[in-house]
């Protein structure tokens, strides 16, 4: 079982120093700041699931050198920043979504000896990300859905 920790209060002070190894901001409808970094030098698991996030501001994650698991499930991501994708040791847990193509490509080109990348569908089943992208995000399909999202997953 994956470890868990208690959800933080909805009123998050982004200037505060968090000392825990696990932070849970799940389901708080947060808006992540673009111009400041989360101060959590010990955190290895960060749960941002279910927050309606469309992007992951790279500055927000800049100082999380110990981060191992980033859970962004149940967020309608439209892009994943290249600098975040290039963190080869970061285990990103995200919905199956065509926006993960850049993450997949950067990992493939920059990170050797990695486990196959996974993504999650709406039933919480895991899928091989490569296979998902190949089947669901071919150029014709991506243009047909406009944003490139696999709409029936959201």
């Amino acid at each position: 079982l994956e470890p868990s920790c208690t959800v933080s209060s909805a009123d998050v002070d982004w200037n505060a120093e968090f000392s825990a190894t696990c932070l849970n901001f799940s389901g708080l409808s947060l808006s992540l700041p673009h111009n400041q970094s989360l101060r959590a030098s010990n955190v290895i698991l960060l749960d941002l699931s279910g927050n309606g996030l469309r992007e992951l501001p790279v500055t927000f994650f800049a100082h999380l050198q110990k981060l191992e698991v980033l859970n962004v499930l149940r967020n309608p991501l439209s892009r994943v920043d290249g600098a975040l994708a290039a963190r080869c040791d970061l285990d990103l847990q995200a919905d199956c979504n065509c926006a993960l193509e850049s993450w997949h490509d950067i990992r493939r080109d920059n990170c050797s000896g990695q486990k196959p990348l996974l993504c999650w569908d709406t039933t919480s089943s895991q899928h091989n990300l490569s296979a998902f992208l190949e089947v669901s995000c071919a150029p014709g399909l991506a243009s047909a859905t406009g944003s490139g999202h696999h709409h029936h997953h959201h």
């Epitope: 079982l1 994956e2 470890p3 868990s4 920790c5 208690t6 000392s19 825990a20 190894t21 696990c22 849970n24 030098s41 010990n42 290895i44 698991l45 050198q65 110990k66 191992e68 698991v69 040791d89 285990d91 486990k115």
Partner: antibody, heavy 125, light 107 residues
Framework: QITLKESGPGILQPSQTLSLTCSFS??????????VSWIRQPSGKGLEWLAH???????RYNPSLRSRLTISKDTSSNQVVLKLTNVDTADTATYYC?????????????????WGAGTTVTVSS | DVVMTQTPKSMSMSVGERVTLSCKAS??????VSWYQQKPDQSPKLLIF???NRYTGVPDRFTGSGSATDFTLTISSVQAEDLADYHC?????????FGSGTKLEIK
């Protein structure tokens, strides 16, 4: 096979500096997520975490002993060293080093999977 | 600091009996609790991590449960070789802390 082995002076006098070495094999302290902690145990008592050093040379200390502790690593010789200054009889204990490794199959956990056999330290005048 | 309180301090059980050891945290530590077994004159050995995950090679008679502040280690059918001290520890926040241990004796 992963092993850790502690070594120390055995006996020292109050006010001296205790220097302990953890020699390890079977893993590299340059691997992301890897780290080594020092933990001590007075005879017949519980465990007390002292300090941790990460693969990137970042360090954490127990605030109750922070002013007296220094942890360092030598990745080329696979050793972690702990120094405790101004020792007192209360520092008499068995000192263990223990490894924390990232678990890629159980993501996000933190635990000490391998411990050394320990080295006994007696502070006596 | 998070205080980990273990009960009982010691217990004496017969082979085959069910053993329940308790560990309480002074504040919420999620599931960042591990259990270690320490046999006489040996170093601690990992039994359970993440409150309920059995470590590789640990017999399935050992089971961990709990979250937040209340944690339990259960030995379903105690064996003579289970004579040991059992320690719980939290790795949710620095400084990491351990309970004072429970000594398990076999009748």
């Amino acid at each position: 096979q992963i092993t850790l082995k502690e070594s120390g002076p055995g006996i020292l006098q109050p006010s001296q500096t205790l220097s302990l070495t953890c020699s390890f094999s079977g893993f590299s302290l340059t691997t992301s997520g890897m780290g080594v902690s020092w933990i001590r145990q007075p005879s017949g008592k519980g465990l007390e975490w002292l300090a941790h050093i990460y693969w990137d040379d970042d360090k954490r200390y127990n605030p109750s002993l922070r002013s007296r502790l220094t942890i360092s690593k030598d990745t080329s010789s696979n050793q972690v060293v702990l120094k405790l200054t101004n020792v007192d009889t209360a520092d008499t204990a068995t000192y263990y080093c223990a490894r924390r490794a990232r678990d890629y199959y159980n993501s996000g956990h933190w635990y000490f999977d391998v411990w050394g056999a320990g080295t006994t330290v007696t502070v006596s005048s | 600091d998070v205080v980990m309180t273990q009960t009982p301090k010691s217990m004496s059980m017969s082979v085959g009996e069910r053993v329940t050891l308790s560990c309480k945290a002074s504040e919420n530590v999620g599931t960042y609790v591990s259990w270690y077994q320490q046999k006489p004159d040996q170093s601690p050995k990992l039994l359970i991590f993440g409150a309920s995950n059995r470590y590789t090679g640990v017999p399935d008679r050992f089971t961990g449960s709990g979250s937040a502040t209340d944690f339990t280690l259960t030995i379903s059918s105690v064996q003579a070789e289970d004579l040991a001290d059992y320690h719980c520890g939290q790795t949710y926040s620095f400084p990491f802390t351990f309970g004072s241990g429970t000594k398990l004796e076999i009748k």
